[in-house]
Interface confidence: medium
């Protein structure tokens, strides 16, 4: 079955609780549920989401039974209307509950909170989390699936699947070792970064999607299929991007069992055609069903296929360029991307969409021109600069990362963009610059040939958590501009800012700068984060502070912590070492 | 030997309907996305519309959309294009092609069928 061609079915609740099994429907009904009633206890989704399947299997005994016939927003969205406390704990959000479908679901998706009040996860000791697991390893894996998916209301329902799989296999294999908690922390950790890059990659695509169109998706799918497949004809790079549009359209608009489903087939698609596609899939489509799908989203590029004509030719010299152009827009130009993103896997899909771009823009305006060859026979010359920049900034930032390490990599980072958007949340600007700064250690290891993809690419998806988070409370006319005038230009555009000459500096407040002893026992990370914090927030009070005071200043934190976490009587020296330090950086800094 | 053959052409009034088919042989049909081309006379070729092996996605000229659907049957190795609420413009010679492996060249074609719009 084809991911467009569908049997009419009576019952859709029935024909995907066929599909996807009772395990994977339950799943994915308690992800959806998660994502949208974020507050709700999981006591509460698990009985709501035992309600919709034993409503399903009556549909899947007869199809023509009572509400068999509705669609699953209708029937999801009654129930998550049925939640006794939804406008307590909701608010205004209870009033979708008013609407009709489809309003009713786009309302529920406009209230997915990106950053919802709740408690950081924290960590059992390793005998509680197995013995947990063993008691009720059903009701311990629902609750990692919830946990997360509250968390992240837009994970990628199918890949959170294999996510939990994953798991469940770390606790299966670590609560039968020898020594428990190293063989299941390490596994542990991994999921966690693993899962919040995971996360962070889908938020990319979904506000692409909704905030930018399936045209702008579609682009980008384009660009980096031809990457990944360049052996592919350009008819399998279009069948591709239109299959995996809808799949991540699906997800990103909360349908979640159409959007798993739909993801199978184009696995079974892609492994049935895998030769007309590429030689690096044989590996992935040996493996199951959850596995095989994340094999083929993470599968390497395959070789270019050897003696690719120039580019010129089709799209520069011949005389036909304006006549292809104007007969089919898009498609002319999706075959412009194509060509170039399979003879450059060198180049990150935001660059190759930038040189699209700027090649349309160029027959826009020579087409319509007295000699249209004329006009746009240098195109190619104008590609440079747009090439050179992101390659020079790259080259910049990984020689400051081989001299400064990550953590000093991540300071250099917070202190220019603090500077850049000083109005924005001190913690979201810790967030955000200390995963601006984790670029270092992800890509400037790599050759110059991958350096780009892997960098800016990853810039994108990082900038991409500033805008989402920004967009819930507005503080800055600079981060709106440069998150919604376009997709692919954000890094540049966040590039460019200079120092905000019209923020008023914020008041110091002594407060800010007081420390407990309580920094004695954080990990290291945590730490880190408190640290910077303290930097965010010292370049508020003095945005024209220089490099050379601020690290006056954050040595001398440093030293005070270092010290005071030494002491015998920690609070006292906390109290007073304290007050010293903020009077002697209030001095430094001329506050 | 690698072998299309259009039929269905003809004349017919503004408005009106007509059926093209094209049979295919000596390629594996079901594993090649084929299109359409048509060609006005004294005019240069235009592409008219582009069907996936599987069926989907398809695509169309601008000059088309919403008149004309592209579709095929692997089973009987044929490809077909209805055109509905023809136009004068629309008089052409009307060529199936196997669609290009990359660049902007045309395999194989057929010999065409002649579509005539007019009252």
């Known amino acids: 079955r084809g991911v467009f061609r569908r049997d009419a079915h009576k019952s859709e609740v029935a024909h995907r609780f066929k599909d996807l099994g009772e395990e994977n429907f339950k799943a994915l009904v308690l992800i959806a549920f998660a994502q949208y009633l974020q507050q709700c206890p999981f006591e509460d989704h698990v009985k709501l989401v035992n309600e919709v399947t034993e409503f399903a299997k009556t549909c899947v005994a007869d199809e023509s039974a009572e509400n068999c016939d509705k669609s699953l927003h209708t029937l999801f969205g009654d129930k998550l209307c049925t939640v006794a406390t939804l406008r307590e704990t909701y608010g205004e959000m209870a009033d979708c509950c008013a609407k009709q479908e489809p309003e009713r679901n786009e309302c529920f998706l406009q209230h997915k909170d990106d950053n919802p009040n709740l408690p950081r996860l924290v960590r059992p000791e390793v005998d509680v989390m197995c013995t947990a697991f063993h008691d009720n390893e059903e009701t311990f894996l629902k609750k990692y699936l919830y946990e997360i998916a509250r968390r992240h209301p837009y994970f990628y329902a199918p890949e959170l699947l294999f996510f939990a799989k994953r798991y469940k296999a770390a606790f299966t294999e670590c609560c039968q070792a020898a020594d428990k908690a190293a063989c299941l922390l390490p596994k542990l950790d991994e999921l966690r970064d693993e899962g919040k890059a995971s996360s962070a990659k889908q938020r990319l695509k979904c506000a692409s999607l909704q905030k930018f169109g399936e045209r702008a998706f579609k682009a980008w799918a384009v660009a980096r299929l031809s990457q990944r497949f360049p052996k592919a004809e350009f008819a399998e790079v279009s069948k591709l991007v239109t299959d995996l549009t809808k799949v991540h359209t699906e997800c990103c608009h909360g349908d979640l069992l159409e959007c798993a489903d739909d993801r199978a087939d184009l696995a079974k698609y892609i492994c049935e055609n895998q030769d007309s596609i590429s030689s690096k899939l044989k590996e992935c489509c040996e493996k199951p069903l959850l596995e095989k799908s994340h094999c083929i989203a993470e599968v390497e590029n395959d070789e270019m296929p050897a003696d690719l004509p120039s580019l010129a030719a089709d799209f520069v010299e011949s005389k036909d360029v304006c006549k292809n152009y104007a007969e089919a827009k898009d498609v002319f130009l999706g075959m412009f991307l194509y060509e170039y993103a399979r003879r450059h896997p060198d180049y990150s899909v935001v660059l190759l969409l930038r040189l699209a771009k700027t090649y349309e823009t160029t027959l826009e305006k020579c087409c319509a021109a007295a000699d249209p060859h004329e006009c746009y026979a240098k195109v190619f010359d104008e590609f440079k600069p747009l090439v050179e920049e992101p390659q020079n900034l790259i080259k910049q930032n990984c020689e400051l990362f081989e001299q400064l390490g990550e953590y000093k990599f991540q300071n250099a980072l917070l202190v220019r963009y603090t500077k850049k958007v000083p109005q924005v949340s001190t913690p979201t600007l810790v967030e955000v610059s200390r995963n601006l700064g984790k670029v270092g250690s992800k890509c400037c290891k790599h050759p110059e040939a991958k350096r780009m993809p892997c960098a800016e690419d990853y810039l994108s998806v990082v900038l991409n958590q500033l805008c989402v988070l920004h967009e819930k409370t507005p503080v800055s006319d600079r981060v709106t501009k440069c998150c919604t005038e376009s997709l692919v230009n954000r890094r540049p555009c966040f590039s460019a800012l200079e120092v905000d000459e019209t923020y008023v500096p914020k008041e110091f407040n002594a407060e800010t700068f007081t420390f407990h002893a309580d920094i004695c026992t954080l990990s290291e990370k945590e730490r880190q984060i408190k640290k910077q914090t303290a930097l965010v927030e010292l370049v508020k009070h003095k945005p024209k502070a220089t490099k050379e005071q601020l690290k006056a200043v954050m040595d001398d934190f440093a030293a005070f912590v270092e010290k005071c976490c030494k002491a015998d009587d920690k609070e006292t020296c906390f109290a007073e070492e304290g007050k010293k330090l903020v009077a002697a950086s209030q001095a430094a800094l001329g506050l | 030997e690698v072998q299309l053959l259009e039929s269905g052409g003809g004349l017919v009034q503004p408005g009106g309907s007509l059926r093209l088919s094209c049979a295919a042989s000596?390629?594996?049909?079901?594993?090649?996305?084929m299109l359409w081309v048509r060609q006005a006379p004294g005019k240069g070729l235009e592409w008219v519309s582009v069907?996936?092996?599987?069926?989907?996605?398809?695509y169309y000229a601008d000059s088309v959309k919403g008149r004309f659907t592209i579709s095929r049957d692997n089973s009987k190795n044929t490809l077909y294009l209805q055109m509905n609420s023809l136009r004068a413009e629309d008089t052409a010679l009307y060529y199936c092609?196997?669609?290009?492996?990359?660049?902007?060249?045309?395999?194989?074609w057929g010999q065409g069928t002649l579509v005539t719009v007019k009252s």
């Open positions: 092609a196997k669609f290009p492996s990359s660049r902007m060249k045309f395999d194989y």
């Open positions: 000596g390629f594996t049909f079901d594993t090649s996305s």
């Open positions: 069907i996936h092996q599987s069926g989907t996605p398809t």
